[in-house]
């Protein structure tokens, strides 16, 4: 994968692809992030790493992505969730997979749910199971707006670079 | 469906929609692909038909998107799976079916999954099931890379205009 | 916009390419619909609420969105269904949940399937079950031409604003 | 430049019909709608419905449907208007109009008007 | 379908005038809305699109301003062309209602 074996540096060199001259103006920010594989039970988001990036004014603070500028984004993020069967000794709850991208914003004292995507599973004996969440959509956002997510079943999560991802980009 | 029942270059012409201008420096490459529904067991992408199109300098060889220019494009496909029960004879063995966006380019002698979703299927008893997988998101991609698919469960794909696809566009 | 202020000859050329001509170079159509959660058995569309929004020449007409100027758009959906788990004294028979994005332009005495998805759900004892579907992708449109959609199991569709929803924008 | 020019207005009885033209020139045709928009004497604008006449898309107003049928003809560059079963209430100036955006009514013809009277 | 409710039907202002004629619409509309001048015997011309923006060639002391139900366009300082009449227009869905008109007269 992009920089694998490379130095740090060589390796951000490495994702520096060949850009169009822009104006000013036509500064198109935007962001992709990928989890981190190495925080299993925990959900970090990371632009330094694959094909991850940040550009054009989108920071990360917190775990959540800061809207450089306002305007309309389209935002969408994934996830893919596995288990194993549950043992014959132990008894088969059913597990409630969830995925959310939320808005913290100052004109709201609370987080927003922008996308929504849930699953119930109910694992079975010697039934390996695996489900994929997909959602993504444009919104009206403001300068220093927050997005972040949430997701029920972190310990589930597949974690490699193109199946748990979370992005924006400017319209 | 667009062109049905027209002869080759009216189809082509039936899809020429009225557009606007650009100046060169803002041409938009597009391209949205469609699953060849006569091939059955084999997912072969098309853009000469129904609603598929390329634009402003994407291309098709050997199956997968060239990308014209260097920049960020956004990157998408779908794929929706069936299948009917198992004869009570059989034997119902799990079906692993996943899709997933591949970038080869020439900066890695390899293809770097770009978007991958999974499912396990446990087909049941007079039981037909249907699946839909989707994903998409922004890519730093180099003139030349070449984007294409792999798919487990080719024979169980619903061959349609609307329900398997694959596309992209510059930001 | 195009060929606004340019003579016909400039205006011509101004339409080789899906964009807007850059007189009104700041112009984005882009729409972000949600169902409204008042109407519990019909998927009515909404603009006027929420994160929706319509903005630069999008519009509703018969719960379809009016495309503003032709061109490339993006063009996306989602929904959410959830249903309990079936009582034993009924029979529990298979669900068809499916949702659809069609086209409807006179030129078709038909409306014509841009986006599928599509689900089967067997309902188990004591299961309450919850099942999410996503799709967009890129079309080409013509002024005029009217998006809508339609679904198979509306009884069981989550209808908040971010589970529920339907959008687009100009390329 | 755009230009819209419309014709075949005129005394009309009531229960009979008409059949506008609005001619069109100055930009390609078939990238653009044609609305039709009336305006009683005295009174208001009312939207009739439009007609795109690159694939022959059309959509009306409610008020106006099963009796308002908006065409085109690519080859002559103009739009069409029929209405019937006229009544009083339908004396107006008739407007042909091409949008930028879908609803926004930028470009004009002068109107032509229609009395329906015996 | 939506009405649009204009206020006031007519007014008499003097050159240099500050002008506002409001429009309310009978449900939400988000910001599609637009206004057109219209002068007699004449075709309306169109002046704001999507609540607040000018369009090409219309003088900048047109302004139109509001989103929801609530609209107003503004004329900072009235010039002798600008008497006539000034229509709003929902275009949140068809079909796309007026509303009824307000006169701008010489006082």
């Known amino acids: 994968l992009p920089g694998v074996g490379l130095t740090p540096s060589a390796a951000q060199t490495a994702r520096q692809h060949p850009k169009m001259h822009l104006a000013h103006s036509t500064l198109k920010p935007a962001a992709h992030l990928i989890g981190d594989p190495s925080k299993q039970n925990s959900l970090l988001w990371r632009a330094n790493t694959d094909r991850a990036f940040l550009q054009d004014g989108f920071s990360l603070s917190n775990n959540s992505l800061l809207v450089p500028t306002s305007g309309i984004y389209f935002v969408y993020s994934q996830v893919v969730f596995s288990g194993k069967a549950y043992s014959p000794k132990a008894t088969s709850s059913p597990l409630y997979l969830a995925h959310e991208v939320q808005l913290f914003s100052s004109q709201y004292p609370f987080h927003v749910p922008l996308l929504s995507s849930q699953k119930m599973v109910y694992p079975g004996l010697q039934e390996p199971w695996l489900h994929s969440m997909y959602h993504g959509a444009a919104f009206q956002l403001t300068q220093g707006d927050q997005l972040s997510t949430h997701t029920d079943g972190i310990p589930h999560l597949v974690l490699s670079p193109s199946t748990v991802f979370f992005g924006a980009f400017a319209l | 469906l667009p062109g049905v029942g027209l002869t080759p270059s009216a189809a082509q012409t039936a899809r020429q929609h009225p557009k606007m201008h650009l100046a060169h420096s803002t041409l938009k490459p597009a391209a949205h692909l469609i699953g060849d529904p006569s091939k059955q067991n084999s997912l072969l992408w098309r853009a000469n038909t129904d609603r598929a199109f390329l634009q402003d300098g994407f291309s098709l060889s050997n199956n997968s998107l060239l990308v014209p220019t260097s920049g960020i494009y956004f990157v998408y496909s779908q794929v929706v799976f069936s299948g009917k029960a198992y004869s009570p004879k059989a034997t119902s063995s799990p079906l692993y079916l996943a899709h997933e966006v591949q970038l080869f380019s020439s900066q890695y002698p390899f293809h770097v999954p770009l978007l991958s979703s999974q499912k396990m299927v446990y087909p049941g008893l007079q039981e037909p099931w249907l699946h839909s997988m989707y994903h998409g998101a922004a890519f730093q991609l180099t003139q030349g890379d070449q984007l294409s698919t792999h798919t487990d469960g080719i024979p169980h794909l619903v061959l349609s205009p609307s329900t398997v696809f694959f596309g992209a566009f510059a930001l | 916009l195009p060929g606004v202020g340019l003579t016909p000859s400039a205006a011509q050329t101004a339409r080789q390419h899906p964009k807007m001509h850059l007189a009104h170079s700041t112009l984005k159509p882009a729409a972000h619909l949600i169902g409204d959660p008042s109407k519990q058995n019909s998927l009515l569309w909404r603009a006027n609420t929420d994160r929706a929004f319509l903005q630069d020449g999008f519009s509703l007409s018969n719960n379809s969105l009016l495309v503003p100027t032709s061109g490339i758009y993006f063009v996306y959906s989602q929904v959410v269904f959830s249903g309990k788990a079936y009582s034993p004294k009924a029979t529990s028979s298979p669900l068809y949940l499916a949702h659809e994005v069609q086209l409807f332009s006179s030129q078709y005495p038909f409306h014509v399937p841009l986006l599928s998805s599509q689900k089967m759900v067997y309902p188990g004892l004591q299961e309450p079950w919850l099942h999410s579907m996503y799709h967009g992708a890129a079309f080409q449109l013509t002024q005029g031409d009217q998006l809508s959609t339609h679904t198979d199991g509306i009884p069981h569709l989550v209808l908040s604003p971010s589970t529920v929803f339907f959008g687009a924008f100009a390329l | 430049e755009v230009q819209l020019v419309e014709s075949g207005g005129g005394l009309v009885q009531p229960g009979g019909s008409l059949r506008l033209s609005c001619a069109a020139s100055?930009?390609?045709?078939?990238?653009?709608?044609i609305h039709w928009v009336r305006q009683a004497p005295g009174k208001g604008l009312e939207w009739v419905g439009y007609?795109?006449?690159?694939?022959?898309?059309?959509n009306y107003n409610e008020k106006f449907k099963g009796r308002a049928t908006i065409s085109s003809d690519k080859s002559k560059n103009t739009a069409y208007l029929q209405m019937n079963s006229l009544r009083a209430e339908d004396t107006a100036v008739y407007y042909c109009?091409?949008?930028?955006?879908?609803?926004?009514?930028?470009?004009w013809g002068q109107g032509t008007l229609v009395t329906v009277s015996s | 379908d939506i009405q649009m409710t204009q206020s006031p039907s007519s007014l008499s202002a003097s050159v240099g005038d500050r002008v506002t004629i409001t429009c309310r619409a009978s449900?939400?509309?988000?910001?599609?809305v637009a206004w057109y001048q219209q002068k007699p015997g004449k075709a309306p011309k169109l002046q704001i699109y999507s609540a607040s923006h000018r369009y090409t060639g219309v003088p900048s002391r047109f302004s139109g301003s509001g989103s929801g139900t609530d609209f107003t366009l503004t004329i900072s300082s009235l010039q002798p062309e600008d008497f006539a009449t000034y229509y709003c227009?929902?275009?949140?869905?068809?079909?796309?209602?007026f509303g009824q008109g307000t006169k701008v007269e010489i006082k």
């Open positions: 227009q929902e275009v949140y869905s068809t079909p796309w209602t």
């Open positions: 007609n795109n006449p690159y694939n022959d898309g059309t």
């Open positions: 449900q939400a509309v988000s910001s599609a």
């Open positions: 109009s091409r949008p930028t955006m879908l609803p926004w009514f930028a470009y």
């Open positions: 100055g930009y390609t045709f078939t990238s653009y709608v």
